[in-house]
């Protein structure tokens, strides 16, 4: 109430940029906090199927839009066939997870590995067996699976037949795929993520063309894709809520990614307004319909009225509240390359704590899972990844401050990534794994990097001890 009254910002995220120490929820003087995370804090690590599985056409797997994009757009990348070969070396991934001591493993299911042309008929038996074995192995080791249904690898057949996410036909097809996954894996999965970072799917897939399917320049298509992604997520949430939650007793969300931004002039109301607009145009675009009032943010509706689809009153009601927690991604993919339109002439910042505070203020202090966090190193760096440790310490310190000092309800943290792998438009030029993989080797040994030992220690101590 005080925040609303004093700042005049009606309790929204703009209060974050107020540098008056009486109002700002972020205490900048607290540079590092030696403390532990809450008891039973959920420590995990993640991967994306396309990034690590390899075997892009093995055992009946169908091609994805990314397999196609690699062959047509990323000329100096042969394919993801090499990668870390998790499809072949599942046991090696499990021993790495076992070693690091995580509470959960977040991975994605490759839609075309289960259904080669995307349509739910009879599942590809080898694909089904792979994910079933992975889940069983995790359960045996008391590692909770967090399963993402869509991490960008749309079956190519759906792109070619329907135009992919531009076509609202895909909403029902995605729901069928989700239903199958709930039926087959829901006995072992208590946490589901529908879509990983839909902002990047829409913006880079259909705006800049930097991601598959590589379409560019059509702003109407960008927002149509975003609209269909939100509706697909919502449909799946309602499906799970009605038909599966009663007996499977799980939770479901969508991972939303964002950058953070600081005003050029901290006292300047216009710069603060631009920062708010920047966050709204990236995170608010998807968070507002799902975690907010069921509609797009007002600023977006006004500014993009000619290209932004409209939610009917019934749809708004349907979208609102379709997430059981706020799954948040904060990593390099939302920073490089940053949408210059979203920057609005302000300064990007890696302040995760402030981003979490913004979410708290905008969306009524939800329970938050950091669903992806970490940085990257150059591909030449092998196991001595000191930069990655520095960044991890920094990020984790910010999360801990957010929990302890700002009373933000972060309940889990996903280090990204378990393994070095295929890094989208950066292909194999950067590494994000806590385990080093020589992509040219036959056995693809997972070698623990310094960051793996560091994260393992953090998990063991549940934070930072003096």
């Amino acid at each position: 109430i005080l925040l609303r009254a004093v700042t005049g910002f009606s309790g929204d995220g703009r209060a974050i940029w107020s540098k008056n120490p009486n109002f700002t929820p972020v205490n900048e003087s607290q540079l590092f906090l030696y403390d532990t995370f809450p008891k039973n804090f959920f420590w995990g690590i993640g991967t994306g199927a396309l990034q690590v599985e390899g075997s892009w056409k093995k055992d009946g797997k169908g091609p994805s839009i990314w397999d196609h994009f690699i062959h047509t757009h990323l000329k100096n990348v042969s394919s993801t066939n090499g990668s870390s070969d998790s499809y072949i070396f599942l046991e090696k991934d499990l021993s790495a997870l076992d070693f690091i001591g995580v509470s959960f493993y977040q991975f994605s299911i490759s839609w075309p590995r289960l259904f080669p042309d995307g349509i739910v008929t009879v599942a590809n038996a080898k694909g089904l067996q792979y994910y079933s074995t992975l889940l069983d192995a995790l359960v045996l080791r008391n590692i909770e699976p967090i399963v993402t249904l869509y991490h960008w690898d749309l079956p190519l057949a759906l792109q070619e037949k329907y135009g992919g996410w531009k076509n609202d036909t895909i909403i029902d097809i995605f729901n069928d795929y989700a239903t199958y996954c709930f039926q087959m894996f829901g006995d072992r999965v208590k946490y589901w993520i529908t879509i990983h970072n839909p902002y990047l799917v829409a913006w880079h897939g259909y705006g800049t063309g930097m991601h598959a399917p590589g379409e560019k320049g059509n702003l109407a298509a960008v927002y149509t894709v975003g609209h269909n992604l939100i509706k697909a997520h919502s449909k799946v949430w309602h499906n799970y809520n009605t038909h599966f939650r009663p007996h499977q007793k799980g939770w479901l969300s969508i991972t939303l990614g964002s950058h953070w931004i600081e005003p050029n002039r901290s006292e300047n109301t216009m710069d603060i307004f631009k920062c708010q607009q920047s966050m709204v145009s990236v995170l608010g675009w998807f968070a507002n319909p799902i975690h907010g009032d069921g509609d797009y943010p007002e600023g977006m509706r006004k500014k993009l009225f000619s290209v932004l689809p409209i939610f009917s009153e019934a749809e708004k009601h349907e979208m609102r509240g379709t997430a059981d927690f706020f799954a948040f991604s904060f990593g390099p993919n939302n920073f490089k390359p940053l949408n210059t339109m979203a920057k609005m002439g302000q300064n990007v910042s890696l302040n995760l704590r402030e981003a979490l505070n913004w979410i708290k203020l905008e969306y009524n202090n939800p329970r938050i899972l950091i669903a992806e966090n970490g940085w990257f190193t150059d591909s030449r760096v092998k196991t001595e990844d000191t930069t990655a440790i520095y960044m991890m310490k920094n990020f984790l310190s910010q999360v801990l401050q957010a929990i302890r000092l700002d009373e933000i309800r972060v309940f889990g943290y996903t280090a990204w990534s378990l393994l070095d792998g295929f890094e989208w438009q950066d292909a194999y030029t950067i590494r994000r794994g806590l385990f080093y993989v020589d992509f040219n080797s036959k056995q693809k040994e997972r070698k623990p990097k310094s960051s793996a030992h560091y994260y393992k220690q953090i998990i063991r101590e549940n934070g930072f001890s003096l």
């Epitope: 090696k92 021993s95 070693f99 192995a137 056995q443």
Partner: antibody, heavy 120, light 107 residues
Framework: EVQLQQSGAELLKPGASVRLSCTAS????????THWVRQRPEQGLEWIGR????????KYDPKFQGKAKILADTSSNTAYLQLIGLTSEDTAVYYC?????????????WGQGTSVTVSS | DIQMTQSSSYLSVSLGGRVTITCKAS??????LAWYQQKPGNAPRLLIS???NLETGIPSRFSGSGSGKDYTLTITSLQTEDVATYYC?????????FGSGTKLEIK
Amino acid sequence: EVQLQQSGAELLKPGASVRLSCTASGFNIQDTFTHWVRQRPEQGLEWIGRIDPSNGNTKYDPKFQGKAKILADTSSNTAYLQLIGLTSEDTAVYYCASRALGNGYAMDYWGQGTSVTVSS
Amino acid sequence: DIQMTQSSSYLSVSLGGRVTITCKASDHINNWLAWYQQKPGNAPRLLISGASNLETGIPSRFSGSGSGKDYTLTITSLQTEDVATYYCQQYWNTPFTFGSGTKLEIK
């Protein structure tokens, strides 16, 4: 070159305790799991348990619980197997074994074995 | 615990012959199986992991196959240096368990 060097043979009386050592060279034991395996005379292999030397976490076959304790000292790159309340049934060769972590669970590096004889 | 059964304790085979050693798990182990060779007075040597992946430096006459509960180690052309005891081991779940071993002799 990767090697696991085990301590020498032991001749012990019933009721005694013993600590066997396994020192790694060519790799850091903190980077993987160390297993211990028993082989009684003219018998097969039995998995005793394993340790994660970087944090001391252990897992045992329940039948060895209370009989065997696995420890590690990272400063000397050494894993230990402590056996208590020895009886003639514990007469066996004890092997330590390991594997480059990133290659899974099967054991590709083995020590030469330590012979333990329990006799009155 | 998962029981591993090697039905043949002894196998007598001619030099140059083909040998098949079987191993049955009491539960599904999803190919998480290793084969070891042990010669008298020596430590075991890992031949195959993941039911069928030949370890570095192991001759190609050794191969592994199987799925679910049933697994096989095959030696295509038996050499004198292959005379040893062979053990299977599952590592799907702890406690990791070994089969009782199959001793190979020359006929």
